[in-house]
């Protein structure tokens, strides 16, 4: 991952805004603050992005290398099965859940985990790089 222009002048990564990090054709924002799931989603939308939707195992592995033990909200919910916010199913990883009321998804360096959507966690936004 390559940090945005505020932190880096390298020629290969000038195309993400301040506060964002570049990987491939996308920019990622890792929050410092904590919010519940819906407020995290709204934060991302207000920054013209989406709560993180992971496309494959390679992207997930790369992001997990960057994460700590702390869980971050992603754009994943259990609506008659675990689906990303764009409606696509989670099909490349399992998600760990302890309870039926844990219907929102979060990620840390080790796993995808279900959580109650009211819990305040950090979050990750993703958008196509300019």
């Amino acid at each position: 991952l390559c940090q945005g222009s505020k932190y880096s002048t390298c020629a290969s990564c000038p195309s993400c805004p301040d506060h964002w990090m570049k990987y491939g054709n996308h920019c990622y924002y890792f929050s410092v603050e904590k919010k519940d799931w819906i407020s995290s989603l709204e934060f991302c939308l207000a920054r013209d992005s989406h709560l993180l939707m992971i496309t494959d195992k390679q992207e997930m592995s790369l992001l997990q290398d960057f994460l700590s033990e702390a869980f971050h909200w992603v754009g994943l919910r259990n609506n008659s099965g675990w689906r990303w916010e764009d409606g696509s199913p989670l099909n490349f990883s399992r998600i760990y859940s302890n309870s039926l009321v844990q219907t929102c998804g979060a990620i840390n360096k080790n796993s995808l985990q279900a959580s109650s959507c009211e819990v305040s966690l950090q979050w990750v936004c993703k958008k196509v790089s300019p």
């Epitope: 805004p17 301040d18 506060h19 929050s31 410092v32 603050e33 904590k34 919010k35 519940d36 819906i38 407020s39 709204e42 934060f43 939308l45 207000a46 920054r47 013209d48 009211e118 305040s120």
Partner: antibody, heavy 119, light 107 residues
Framework: EVQLVESGGGLVKPGGSLKLSCTAS????????MSWVRQTPEKRLEWVAT????????NYPDNVKGRLTISRDNAKNNLYLQMSLLKSEDTAMYYC????????????WGQGTSVTVSS | GIQMTQSPSSLSASLGERVSLTCRAS??????LNWLQQKPDGTIKRLIY???SLDSGVPKRFSGSRSGTDYSLTISSLESEDFVDYFC?????????FGGGTKLEIK
């Protein structure tokens, strides 16, 4: 220095319409989500609308959905609030607010513009 | 939404006195709380963000703290310009909600 200057308030009859404006300066307007917050005559503060950096996304509390519309013109550094089907409970001071980038809510506020809904 | 109960609604104090204002959240909001100051002319300024971080230019006599779901704004030694209105704001959960305000008056 960050400055937010609201205008367009006034007296309007119930059921009427009004458009508020906010002119921003001292920062790169297109890089910030913006909001409107109102303060009732009883001094209660209420968030009423938020718009994304580009203007492609907006968000409202349930009590104003369908009556208030937030928009922006990044070329002019302007934020707007179109108010329609106004009710007496919309009487308030309306503040234009910049959203803190890190998600820590509202970091800069305008001086406000007053809206009175009365027959 | 989350209810923010602010107390007291008004407070009389003397110059140089130490005072604390409190906001109680109806459920956990972590550190996602700001304190705002409103002057008599209506202008609003953020004093503290994320429970305890001071905005730039805010005097060090202002401080913020948390105990569970209770959040406090403390002014260590009141000056004349501090006798205005104060509000808390939670931003952990949508919709953002405000406390009812505290009017700080000079005794």
């Amino acid at each position: 220095e960050v400055q937010l200057v609201e205008s367009g308030g006034g007296l309007v009859k119930p059921g009427g319409s009004l458009k508020l404006s906010c002119t921003a300066s001292g920062f790169t307007f297109r890089n910030y989500a913006m909001s409107w917050v109102r303060q009732t005559p009883e001094k209660r503060l209420e968030w009423v609308a938020t718009i994304s950096e580009s203007g492609n996304y907006n968000n409202y509390p349930d009590n104003v959905k369908g009556r208030l519309t937030i928009s922006r013109d990044n070329a002019k550094n302007n934020l707007y609030l179109q108010m329609s089907l106004l009710k007496s409970e919309d009487t308030a001071m309306y503040y234009c607010v910049r959203d803190d980038w890190e998600g820590r809510a509202m970091d800069y506020w305008g001086q406000g513009t007053s809206v009175t809904v009365s027959s | 939404g989350i209810q923010m109960t602010q107390s007291p609604s008004s407070l009389s104090a003397s110059l140089g006195e130490r005072v604390s204002l409190t906001c109680r959240a109806s459920r956990d909001i972590g550190s996602s709380l700001n304190w705002l100051q409103q002057k008599p002319d209506g202008t609003i300024k953020r004093l503290i963000y994320a429970t305890s971080s001071l905005d730039s230019g805010v005097p060090k006599r202002f401080s913020g703290s948390r105990s569970g779901t209770d959040y406090s704004l403390t002014i260590s030694s009141l000056e004349s310009e501090d006798f205005v209105d104060y509000f808390c704001l939670q931003y952990a959960s949508s919709p953002w909600t405000f406390g009812g305000g505290t009017k700080l008056e000079i005794k």
